[in-house]
């Protein structure tokens, strides 16, 4: 009679993570008598997956009745497959021996490949806010996918970005892989409503890529522009001066009025108006009693935005020496304004 051969008809099997893998094996003869064992890998480090004779293998179920005396089919099913199960599986026939069974013949092996989906991409931006015209970096990470081939793209408001660098780790063979990408984005004043998107495409996703997003509102700081204007005299001896704080983001802002360098009033932006681009406007006004001033008054609107160094704009009020009985002892003149940093 021809010597027993162990046939593993499938050279390779591809299974999605979480599914069940079926590994087939057939012996061509009933002789010699002895059990079948399944191993993953070869050599001294091979791992016992199933022993027909003894042992407890909770993830493995047998497809046919292996206890039947004339059975020559020895397929197994391995449940809840993970990327860690990838490898070559060998069906091995043992010859009954005393005291121990002896390995008799091995099948050629079946390579089990596991397809695992990448995790949802996580996009993270810089730790500190940056102002328009600055370049900031965003990172995107996704883990646990297999096979290694993967495509990653970056978008800003639907427009594909080209300035990015991507790595897939590890470089060598592994049960699963991770991708890490860093993109550079130049901020503009209109980016409060902008979004950066990282898109990952993988064979397991059936053409429906995974996306991770970051809102630039978390990253951008748009510094305000200031304008100080003098309103017409509201009443005798009183001048209304306004400070227009425009196009700032985020909302956190504190304004201080100074009269000749002395703090007059400090307030926090509360009732702001929002612009279409997501930035804010705010106005503060100061009623100046010019009769209380002998000389010209320098009014300064000083703004501290989002914890940054203060910016300011000044306005000079000229106090004229008119006789009081004429009912107008003040002349207000806008002699220009300047913007400067106060540290």
């Amino acid at each position: 009679e021809e010597e027993l051969q162990v046939i593993q008809p499938d050279k390779s099997v591809l299974v999605a993570a979480g599914e069940t893998a079926t590994l087939r094996c057939t012996a061509t003869s009933l002789i010699p008598v002895g059990p079948i064992q399944w191993f993953r890998g070869a050599g001294p480090g091979r791992e016992l997956i199933y022993n027909q004779k003894e042992g407890h293998f909770p993830r493995v179920t047998t497809v046919s009745d292996l206890t039947k005396r004339n059975n020559m089919d020895f397929p197994i099913r391995i449940g809840n497959i993970t990327p860690a199960d990838a490898g070559t599986y060998y069906c091995v026939k043992f010859r009954k021996g005393s005291p121990d069974d002896v390995e008799f013949k091995s099948g050629a092996g079946t390579e089990l490949s596991v397809r695992a989906k990448p995790s949802a991409p996580v996009v993270s931006g810089p730790a500190a806010r940056a102002t328009p015209q600055h370049t900031v970096s965003f990172t995107c990470e996704s883990h646990g996918f297999s096979p290694r081939d993967i495509t990653l793209k970056w978008f800003k408001n639907g427009n594909e970005l080209s300035d990015f660098q991507t790595n897939v780790d590890p470089v060598g063979e592994s049960v699963s892989y991770s991708i890490h990408s860093t993109a550079k984005v130049v901020l503009t004043r209109e980016d409060v409503h902008s979004q950066v998107i990282c898109e990952v495409a993988h064979v397991t996703l059936q053409g429906d890529p995974l996306r991770g997003t970051a809102n630039l509102s978390e990253t951008i700081r748009v510094p305000p522009t200031l304008e100080v204007t003098q309103q017409p005299v509201r009443a005798e001896n009183q001048v209304n001066v306004t400070c227009q704080v425009r196009k700032f983001y985020p909302q956190r802002l504190q304004l201080t009025w100074l009269e000749n360098g002395n703090v007059s009033r400090t307030e926090t932006a509360s009732t702001v108006t929002e612009n279409k681009d997501g930035t804010y406007n705010w106005m503060s006004w100061l009623l100046v009693n010019v009769s209380a001033h002998r000389d010209d008054v320098k009014l300064t609107c000083q703004v501290e935005h989002d914890g940054q160094p203060a910016v300011s704009k000044s306005h000079d009020l000229k106090v004229s020496a008119h006789p009081k009985e004429q009912g107008s002892n003040t002349a207000a003149e806008n002699t220009g304004s300047n913007e400067r940093n106060i540290y």
């Epitope: 050599g43 001294p44 480090g45 016992l48 002896v102 390995e103």
Partner: antibody, heavy 122, light 107 residues
């Protein structure tokens, strides 16, 4: 009781070969991989390779491929290692040890031979 | 190849003292690590297998543990016969590799 009896000390000339033995007793020889380990004078341990007596399947550390050749005679439960093209670098104590026919934690390198000292000298 | 970095390479200690030897694996080896003891005459004996399982006949003062990629052998209460050489060995992946060894000397 499991025991490995290794052959005695060898003094060899550079360029020649030596063949040492490791006789196993006390268990089924064919259920285990036989491994060989090198220890140079005052140095650490280096795994050379292993052989499976059932089918003479061998696996080597790349560093020792072409330098060491592993064989077995199952009828006498003896493993052999031949080291060829000897140089001073091959002067060492060579140990045999074993692991189970699959990766069973409890069976890795439990039992060791007493070692064979090889001295290469002109 | 997986590198096993063993530290310290030598250690002086006193009788009754508690000492720890460490091996760091360059790649993941799970729990597949042995600790071996080598006598001055060359005799090798396994003390610990699978990171923390004590071999039969090995005194309970020997114990093994793991923290991430660091594997430790602790001897609590050194006795005179413990002042010998110790090696770790990974058997997770071929080629199987040993740590450089630790020589434990009496103070």
């Amino acid at each position: 009781e499991v025991q490995f009896q290794q052959s005695g000390t060898v003094l060899a000339r550079p360029g020649t070969s030596v063949k040492m033995s490791c006789k196993a007793s006390g268990s089924t020889f064919t259920s285990y991989w036989m491994h060989w380990v090198k220890q140079g004078p005052g140095q650490g341990l280096q795994w050379i390779g292993a052989i499976y007596p059932v089918n003479n399947d061998t696996t080597y550390n790349q560093k020792f491929k072409g330098k060491a050749e592993l064989t077995v005679v199952t009828s006498t439960s003896t493993a052999y290692m031949e080291v060829s093209s000897l140089t001073n670098e091959d002067s060492a104590v060579y140990y045999c040890t074993r692991s189970f026919y699959y990766s069973l934690d409890a069976a890795w390198f439990v039992y060791w031979g007493q070692g064979t000292l090889v001295t290469v000298s002109a | 190849d997986i590198q096993m970095t063993q530290s310290p390479s030598s250690l002086s200690a006193s009788l009754g003292e508690r000492v720890s030897l460490t091996c760091r694996a360059s790649q993941d080896i799970g729990s597949r690590l042995n600790w071996l003891q080598q006598e001055p005459d060359g005799t090798i004996k396994r003390l610990i297998y699978a990171t923390s399982s004590l071999d039969s006949g090995v005194p309970k003062r020997f114990s093994g543990s793991r923290s991430g990629s660091d594997y430790s052998l602790t001897i609590s209460g050194l006795e005179s016969e413990d002042f010998v050489d110790y090696y770790c060995l990974q058997y997770a992946s071929s080629p199987f590799t040993f740590g450089g060894g630790t020589k434990l000397e009496i103070n």
